[in-house]
Every structure is written in structure tokens, then in C-alpha cells.
């Protein structure tokens, strides 16, 4: 479901990983140097910037974030 | 320097009504959300509820709705809390605080209700 | 309503202690959890944000961590200016809810 406007709840921010606000919506998402093997699962819509240098992801399939814009 | 600058302390009759405003400066208004943050004596924090000034669409917690009503006036930069046929129980300091993309970065100073008879 | 249990409830440390304090949430809240102090007769202050982001101003000897369910506030080498009350909040759903506090007192 979507999320319900409100200014004091917290964009999605994936385990272990370090989000930082980027506007009035918007989150950049920090998940470099985490030894990940796979895109984290749960990344919000809402998210602007993803780092994910330094994991260990041998690739990506089509498409791999169909949730954002 | 962000800045919320709440009315001074109140002292109402059980039944009466209030209004606590909250003047910010040093950004701009429309941009952030309003929260309110009310303590009881001794007690932990508890949220009220929050508006969105640029078009005072609000949220409020379920034990809040009905008695506490949340208002902006954008002319003058300031949100306010009213809360209507008060009770003993109201008392409180009650905190507004600024909000953006989920956390509540600056906070007023506090104002304290007391309901007595 | 998300419920958050704070431990301890207060807590005596001495200047130079390492102190953590902890935050247990009813249900998963996904890293959406912020830390404040509160100083008597003071505003309130964001301390961190997003589980383990430091706000601005706020010394790097306050560290936040955890996931899932459970998170901690951890200081590394308490000063005189951290004895205070600490609160953790939830931001995953509304109504967002805090901790009860942790005063943090002078042993």
C-alpha cells in the first residue's frame, strides 16, 4: 500500500544500509561496502540516490528497480 | 537560525479552552511540517498530530481528534494548537516542532497548560 | 500502535563511561527510528535520525545502531553535557510513538 502523507514518518530505508533525506520526499540511500550479493529488497520509491559500489553483485537483471521512477 | 517561538504558560478552568501558537522563523514556513508534542507531569512524550502548511492538510492521533484542533496562518508564519472543553487530565507542556522527511530536526520551547478549578 | 520499550529506564554512569541504551519496537519498524535529548527547561534535540544518522552539531562520540525490532544509542565517552533524557521514536507508521526515556544521571 502507499504510504499516507505526513511529514514524521521515515522513507524506507534498507537493513544496514545508510539513508540520508534529500528534500521534502526524497532519500539518498548509502549501501556501499555492505559484502551484498543482491539489490536490497526493500528500497523506497521515494528513493533518489543509490550507492551500492563495493558489494558483490555480479549483475543485474533487466529492469532491476521497476519501483522507482 | 531556525527558531519556534511558543506563547507563555496558561492557566485554564476545567471546560474552558486554549490556544498555544507557535511563531517560526529562519526558514521557510510552508516548506516543513508542524508537529505537536504534548508532556505530561512526570511523563514521557506524546504525539498530537501534525500540519502541512502549504495547505493545512492534517494528521492527528486517534486520542487526539475531536478536542485538539491544529490551524497555520502563513501570513504571519505561525501554527496553533487549540484544545476545546478542557480537562484536569490536559495538563501538560506542549511542544511544537518542525518536521521534513521524517524526523523532527528543531523543537519550541515548551508551553506549559495547567487545567484547575 | 507501534509500542517502543526503552531499558533502562535510568541509568548512573560516571564521566569517560561507555553507555548504551536500548529500544525495542512491538513490530519491525525498518530502520525508521530517531533519537532526541531533553535537558530540563530545554528544547528537545534531534540527535540522530534513519536508525544511525548523526544530525548536524551532534558529537560523533553518539552512535545509533540496530534493525529489525531492536536498536541502541550507544556513547561512547560520556561528558558532563550528555546527562540528560533520552528518547527513542518511531517514524514507520502513524501514529509515531517514543520510548518512555532513559534519564541518564551522575553516578
Known amino acids: 500500500g502507499s504510504s499516507p502523507r505526513s511529514g514524521v514518518l521515515l522513507r524506507g530505508c534498507p537493513t544496514h544500509c545508510h539513508c540520508e533525506p534529500d528534500g521534502r520526499m526524497l532519500l539518498r540511500v548509502d549501501c556501499s561496502d555492505l559484502g551484498l550479493s543482491e539489490l536490497p529488497s526493500n528500497l523506497s520509491v521515494f528513493t533518489s540516490y543509490l550507492d551500492l559500489s563495493m558489494n558483490n553483485i555480479s549483475q543485474l537483471l533487466p529492469n532491476p528497480l521497476p519501483s522507482l521512477r | 537560525q531556525v527558531q519556534l517561538v511558543q506563547s507563555g504558560s496558561e492557566l485554564k478552568k476545567p471546560g474552558a479552552s486554549v490556544k498555544v501558537s507557535c511563531k517560526a522563523s529562519?526558514?521557510?514556513?510552508?516548506?516543513?511540517?508542524m508537529q505537536w508534542v504534548r508532556q505530561a507531569p512526570g511523563q514521557g512524550l506524546e504525539w498530537i498530530g501534525e500540519i502541512d502548511p502549504s495547505d493545512s492538510y492534517t494528521n492527528y492521533n486517534q486520542g487526539f481528534t475531536g478536542r485538539f484542533v491544529l490551524s497555520v496562518d502563513t501570513s504571519v508564519s505561525t501554527a496553533y494548537l487549540q484544545i476545546s472543553s478542557l480537562k484536569a487530565e490536559d495538563t501538560a507542556v506542549y511542544y511544537c516542532a518542525r518536521s521534513l522527511s521524517g524526523y523532527v530536526d528543531y523543537w519550541g520551547q515548551g508551553t506549559t497548560v495547567t487545567v484547575s478549578s | 500502535d507501534i509500542q517502543m520499550t526503552q531499558s533502562p529506564s535510568s541509568l548512573s554512569a560516571s564521566v569517560g563511561d561507555r553507555v548504551t541504551i536500548t529500544c525495542r519496537a512491538s513490530q519491525d519498524i525498518s530502520n525508521r527510528l530517531n533519537w532526541y535529548q531533553q535537558k530540563p527547561g530545554k528544547a528537545v534535540k534531534l540527535l540522530i535520525s534513519?536508525?544511525?544518522r548523526l544530525h548536524s552539531g551532534v558529537p560523533s562520540r553518539f552512535s545509533g545502531s540496530g534493525s529489525g525490532t531492536d536498536y541502541t544509542l550507544t556513547i561512547s565517552s560520556l561528558q558532563p553535557e550528555d546527562f540528560a533524557t533520552y528518547y527513542c521514536q518511531q517514524g514507520n507508521s502513524l501514529p509515531p510513538t517514543f520510548g518512555g526515556g532513559t534519564k541518564l544521571e551522575i553516578k
Open positions: 529562519g526558514y521557510t514556513f510552508t516548506n516543513y511540517w
Open positions: 534513519y536508525r544511525s
